[in-house]
């Protein structure tokens, strides 16, 4: 999916009001010095591409974050504010249902969510312009 035509300001507002708080809840008890951000993004569409990948694609050591509250709210925000996003996700959702697993918060998942916070932070930053 190409995130170029999303309403970035509406997604940002949704993140600040709810999604960010769910990420903090997920990370509660983790030291703020524990993880360095290693995943980066260069502009808002790229940030959303990376956010989608880390949120919804299973990785080694962290089978799925897709059923977490922050993930469901992320999916809703993208569906509402990114034209045509919902249609692209139907097949992916059906595949996800087949491989749904018991929720386990591993250290790898915590690290992944820390990376997500970093990606969202880059997405939210003001446009940094060289004068």
């Amino acid at each position: 999916y190409d995130f170029t035509n999303c309403d970035f300001e509406k997604i940002k507002a949704a993140y600040l009001s709810t999604i960010s708080k769910d990420l903090i809840t997920y990370m509660s008890g983790t030291k703020s010095t524990e993880f360095n951000n290693t995943v980066s993004c260069s502009n808002r569409p790229h940030c959303l591409t990376e956010i989608q990948s880390l949120t919804f694609n299973p990785t080694a050591g962290c089978a799925s974050l897709a059923k977490e509250m922050f993930a469901m709210k992320t999916k809703a925000a993208l569906a509402i504010w990114c034209p045509g996003y919902s249609e692209t996700q139907i097949n992916a959702t059906q595949a996800m249902k087949k491989r749904r697993k018991r929720k386990v918060t591993t250290n790898k998942c915590l690290e992944q969510v820390s990376q997500l916070q970093g990606l969202w932070r880059r997405f939210n930053r003001p446009l940094l312009k060289q004068q």
Epitope: K12, A13, L16, F35, R121, F123, P126, L127, L128
Partner: antibody
Framework: QVQLVQSGAEVKKPGASVKVSCKAS????????IEWVRQAPGQGLEWMGI????????YYAQKFQGRVTLTADKSTSTAYMELSSLRSEDSAVYYC????????????WGQGTTLTVSS | DIQMTQSPSSLSASVGDRVTITCRAS??????LVWYQQKPGKAPQLLVY???NLADGVPSRFSGSGSGTQFSLTISSLQPEDFATYYC?????????FGTGTKLEIK
């Protein structure tokens, strides 16, 4: 806990340079931008610029372009603001501040460094 | 550069009063606005981000609203510790200019 500790007060002569430090602790230094703001006596807040400690990328207010240099030392988790060609109107309190977790504000501030420029 | 204009520049009020400070941006900044409180000799403290989200530890008597070019900060019932100077700052693009400030004084 997150802390930003700035260097002590400075007295400089017009034309000289000053370098203010801002030592960060309690968080992953390279993950967050650092902003610099100044406040002249009895005046409002004035935005000077931002540095990304990870990349070293800097963004300056046009007013300070060419006179201010922001740097960051990852090994010591310290940000620096150097201001050159000082004039009396540069007398102010200089603050560093850390970007918030969400990237939508600056949530922790240093205690401020007072600069006096006088002949 | 985006200009931020605050009004009033100063305001006298009493404990228990409801007060509203406004901030106007010279162009559309959507919801990219922050409010800070500053007391004499101290660094600014974050109150509100994203125009309407309260920062951690900020009392619920504070609230932010607005979007586009018009924003406001409301204190529903003034407490003695609320007498200070308040600044808005836009967070849309660099340079991240501040408002001119509003000094809230005891009547």
């Amino acid at each position: 806990q997150v802390q930003l500790v700035q260097s002590g007060a400075e007295v400089k002569k017009p034309g000289a340079s000053v370098k203010v430090s801002c030592k960060a602790s309690g968080y992953a230094f390279t993950n967050y931008l650092i902003e610099w703001v100044r406040q002249a006596p009895g005046q409002g807040l004035e935005w000077m610029g931002i540095i990304n400690p990870e990349s070293g990328d800097t963004y300056y207010a046009q007013k300070f372009q060419g006179r201010v240099t922001l740097t960051a030392d990852k090994s010591t988790s310290t940000a620096y603001m150097e201001l050159s060609s000082l004039r009396s109107e540069d007398s102010a309190v200089y603050y560093c501040a850390k970007e918030s977790l969400t990237g939508s504000s600056y949530d922790y501030w240093g205690q401020g460094t007072t600069l006096t420029v006088s002949s | 550069d985006i200009q931020m204009t605050q009004s009033p520049s100063s305001l006298s009020a009493s404990v228990g009063d409801r007060v509203t400070i406004t901030c106007r941006a010279s162009e559309n900044i959507y919801s990219n606005l922050v409010w800070y409180q500053q007391k004499p000799g101290k660094a600014p403290q974050l109150l509100v981000y994203g125009a309407r989200n309260l920062a951690d530890g900020v009392p619920s008597r504070f609230s932010g609203s607005g979007s586009g070019t018009q924003f406001s900060l409301t204190i529903s019932s003034l407490q003695p510790e609320d007498f200070a100077t308040y600044y808005c700052q836009h967070f849309y693009e660099t340079p991240l200019t501040f408002g001119t400030g509003t000094k809230l004084e005891i009547k």
